[in-house]
């Protein structure tokens, strides 16, 4: 019996087609992805093949103005329109709190939403009961397939799930649910979830009875043969893991941002064992037409977004200096504003010993593309912020050793004076440079704000200590020459859309007046 698994993950609000780098579509003839194009390909496959499941491995939420405005209603609407069969909860599904998950998505989705390792307690338990499930048995033709969900247990540090959801260890939580499926005579089981490729492989290895793992969170691109675009494969598709009980378990992921549709064909024997698995992600490029009906619906929903862009988010009573003359040479108040917003967006009081789990922010000055003039009645709009942060990036959470941070700050000024983008703006950091010294030895003082303290204060950076830092995904990926971050980071979790982080902060503060205050000397 043959099953076709179509899968997406980490779509992050890319409902419309995007450029090849998943930013805003500029030249339509070269654009990719989007739900209208995805629908065309899915329908093509559904028409051609008998047993097809369309699955999503989480993080539909967060990433563009679509999520900012529609807050998840767009996810439910268009996933329903595409007729998804199941979805696993990702960490970003909790970005607007549990209510922001329940109302727009859990109550509106026609498909089951899954996670076996999230347990509700207290008053939330009855409120959320039945709205998400540990597993679901799906009929496919004359057979049944069990889908069991999982979500990153780091979610409390990455999003806002509140205090009434417990995120258990994935493997510990999955095993009894898979065992239950086996007792229900379900012998074909897919683990669908959002914990990253390393955990996906562990699940394949450790959870007895799981036949296939469909993952997300790490934006992993797997491919067999010559890859069709710029993404470099982390391994073959599917990635085969030998389980502890000797089975070959295919593990898949489909990069991110709706650029690819994962396509996996699995052949099962009559006892539900995987006989063979093959496939590849399908690049959703312009050779695949956008479905006119879904496209028309997208255009209808778009109208509200255009109106939102020009509405006032808040006010500034000072000039927000985002000029390259400032931000690539010295501390600039736009950099301070953005870093303050980045830290504010990551306030998570999950431990009494820590005032917060992260206190530091770094931001390449070259990523700040425009100032905002306060003389327009102080008004700040989404449109204004889109000029400051036009690249559609995210502000991510990484873990780095102090020694890596020291290298990053040396790189920040290694060719100071040439108006290059690598000059770092900061938050929760005091750095002193001596530019008379030779490149690679210019950082003379580097103090960082403590986290394990009740009164935050600055202490000297310790080379061997591991620190959490918020930074743009561009830097996490080694952009602007920050190869040391990419090579040496110990953990990387993708965060919220850059403009959304700053706009939320401005809306919260109502009136802002960021200063240049001696963070960089």
């Amino acid at each position: 019996w043959e099953l076709t698994i179509l899968h997406t993950n980490d779509v992050h609000s890319r409902l419309e087609q995007t450029s090849e780098d998943s930013s805003k579509c500029v030249n339509a003839s070269r654009c990719m992805g989007g739900v209208a194009r995805l629908f065309t390909k899915v329908q093509q496959i559904r028409r051609a093949e008998p047993n097809v499941l369309l699955l999503d491995a989480g993080d539909q939420y967060q990433g563009t103005i679509w999520f900012t405005v529609y807050k998840g209603a767009e996810v439910a609407h268009f996933m329903n329109a595409l007729r998804y069969d199941a979805m696993a909860l990702g960490n970003h599904e909790f970005d607007n709190g549990v209510e922001g998950l329940i109302e727009p998505l859990l109550k509106e989705a026609k498909f089951p939403i899954l996670s076996a390792n999230i347990k509700a307690k207290g008053p939330l338990a009855s409120q959320i009961s039945g709205l998400y499930l540990p597993y679901k048995v799906l009929p496919v033709g004359d057979e049944v397939v069990g889908i069991v969900g999982y979500t990153s247990k780091e979610t409390p540090f990455l999003s806002n799930p509140g205090t009434n959801l417990v995120f258990e260890d994935e493997i510990t939580a999955l095993q009894p649910e898979v065992d239950k499926l086996k007792t229900l005579n379900v012998n074909k089981i897919i683990a669908l979830g959002h914990s990253g490729f390393e955990m996906d492989k562990l699940i394949a290895q450790k959870v007895r009875g799981v036949d296939v793992v469909v993952g997300g969170h790490s934006n992993t691109f797997l491919y067999t043969g010559n890859p069709p675009s710029k993404e470099v494969p982390a391994g073959k598709y599917p990635f085969i893991v030998t389980s502890d009980d000797g089975r070959k378990v295919p593990v898949v992921q489909a990069y991110a941002f709706g650029k690819y549709l994962g396509y996996l064909k699995i052949e099962f024997d009559e006892r539900g064992n995987v006989i063979s698995s093959h496939g590849n992600p399908i690049l959703l490029n312009s050779s695949i037409p956008e479905d006119p009906s879904i496209k028309a619906d997208i255009n209808k929903w778009r109208i509200k977004l255009d109106n939102y862009s020009t509405q006032e988010l808040g006010k500034t009573i000072v000039y927000l200096d985002g000029s390259s003359q400032s931000c690539r040479f010295r501390e600039c108040n736009m950099g301070n504003l953005i870093c303050d917003a980045m830290i504010n967006n990551n306030l998570r009081h999950t431990d009494e010993m820590f005032w917060n789990h992260v206190s530091m922010c770094i931001l390449n000055g070259g990523g700040i593309r425009s100032p905002i003039d306060e003389r327009n009645n102080g008004t700040i709009t989404w449109e204004n912020l889109a000029a400051v942060l036009p690249f559609g990036g995210t502000f991510d959470l990484v873990q780095l050793k102090g020694s890596t941070l020291k290298k990053a700050f040396e790189h920040s000024v290694h060719r100071y004076g040439q108006s290059t983008g690598e000059f770092l703006q900061v938050g929760g950091i005091h750095v002193v440079y001596d530019l008379s010294r030779k490149p690679g030895d210019r950082v003379v003082k580097l103090d960082v704000l403590c986290t394990k303290c009740r009164v935050p204060s600055y202490d000297p950076l310790k080379m061997d200590e591991v620190y959490k830092v918020i930074l743009p995904n561009f830097l996490a990926n080694g952009g602007d020459g920050f190869q040391m971050i990419k090579d040496e980071l110990l953990r990387h979790d993708s965060g919220d859309q850059d403009i959304n982080v700053v706009s939320t902060y401005i809306s919260k503060m109502k009136v802002i007046y960021p200063a240049v205050e001696g963070r960089i000397k």
């Epitope: 629908f39 329908q43 559904r46 028409r47 329109a81 007729r83 069969d85 026609k110 498909f111 799906l138 009929p139 496919v140 033709g141 004359d142 057979e143 049944v144 479905d291 009906s293 879904i294 028309a296 619906d297």
Partner: antibody, heavy 121, light 107 residues
Framework: QVQLVESGGGVVQPGRSLRLSCAAS????????MHWVRQAPGKGLEWVAV????????YYPDSVKGRFTISRDNSKNTLYLQMNSLRAEDTAVYYC??????????????WGQGTMVTVSS | DIQMTQSPSSLSASVGDRVTITCRAS??????LAWYQQKPEKAPKSLIY???SLQSGVPSRFSGSGSGTDFTLTISSLQPEDFATYYC?????????FGGGTKVEIK
């Protein structure tokens, strides 16, 4: 082979009740949504009810809502339509039809031969 | 509710003719449209689903097209056994609704 056979039709007085059955064979009945569709003499097709594969949801058009109830017994591979408060306009051939395997609306790939229901005093 | 309007309600054609029947939805239904054939005193038979997919066993002279609100069923070369009534049906949302039917008669 895949087959649907309806039974239970007949002549009934207005206001009375009737229960139709549909016996399924040749496929995994419990995996499919099942529908009733009717056709009044000389008229077109009208959808009457659906029950999802796991009985989790049932849907009806306004014309029969509150009067008709669809149910199924997966252990017996049988679909039912309980029709109460019957009216003259319910006179039709009632077909049972197989839908899809999910919770989304679907088309009908397999149809029964139909059973005639006549509501008349 | 979504209204389905079929046209024409009847047509006369000869064997070998190309026949086109149209179906219009009162609102967008994407490609969630099916076509059925019904002969007198018989149950309907599924021809096409998802607007353009041929049900297995249906001759390739039948084809469907369209998306959104406007759909077409085409019989490329009418055969004697094709004289029947044809219905479209939307399955975008409940309640499921049918077109009024198109009767294809012998000229």
């Amino acid at each position: 082979q895949v087959q649907l056979v309806e039974s239970g039709g007949g002549v009934v007085q207005p206001g009375r009740s009737l229960r139709l059955s549909c016996a399924a064979s040749g496929f995994t009945f419990s995996n499919y949504g099942m529908h009733w569709v009717r056709q009044a003499p000389g008229k077109g097709l009208e959808w009457v009810a659906v029950i999802l594969y796991d009985s989790s949801n049932k849907y009806y058009p306004d014309s029969v809502k509150g009067r008709f109830t669809i149910s199924r017994d997966n252990s017996k591979n049988t679909l039912y339509l309980q029709m109460n408060s019957l009216r003259a306009e319910d006179t039709a051939v009632y077909y049972c039809a197989r839908g899809g395997s999910s919770w989304y609306p679907d088309s009908f790939d397999i149809w029964g031969q139909g059973t005639m229901v006549t509501v008349s005093s | 509710d979504i209204q389905m309007t079929q046209s024409p309600s009847s047509l006369s054609a000869s064997v070998g003719d190309r026949v086109t029947i149209t179906c219009r939805a009162s609102q967008g239904i994407s490609s969630w449209l099916a076509w059925y054939q019904q002969k007198p005193e018989k149950a309907p038979k599924s021809l096409i689903y998802a607007a353009s997919s041929l049900q297995s066993g249906v001759p390739s002279r039948f084809s469907g097209s369209g998306s959104g609100t406007d759909f077409t069923l085409t019989i490329s070369s009418l055969q004697p056994e094709d004289f029947a009534t044809y219905y479209c049906q939307q399955y975008n949302s409940y309640p499921l609704t049918f077109g009024g039917g198109t009767k294809v008669e012998i000229k």
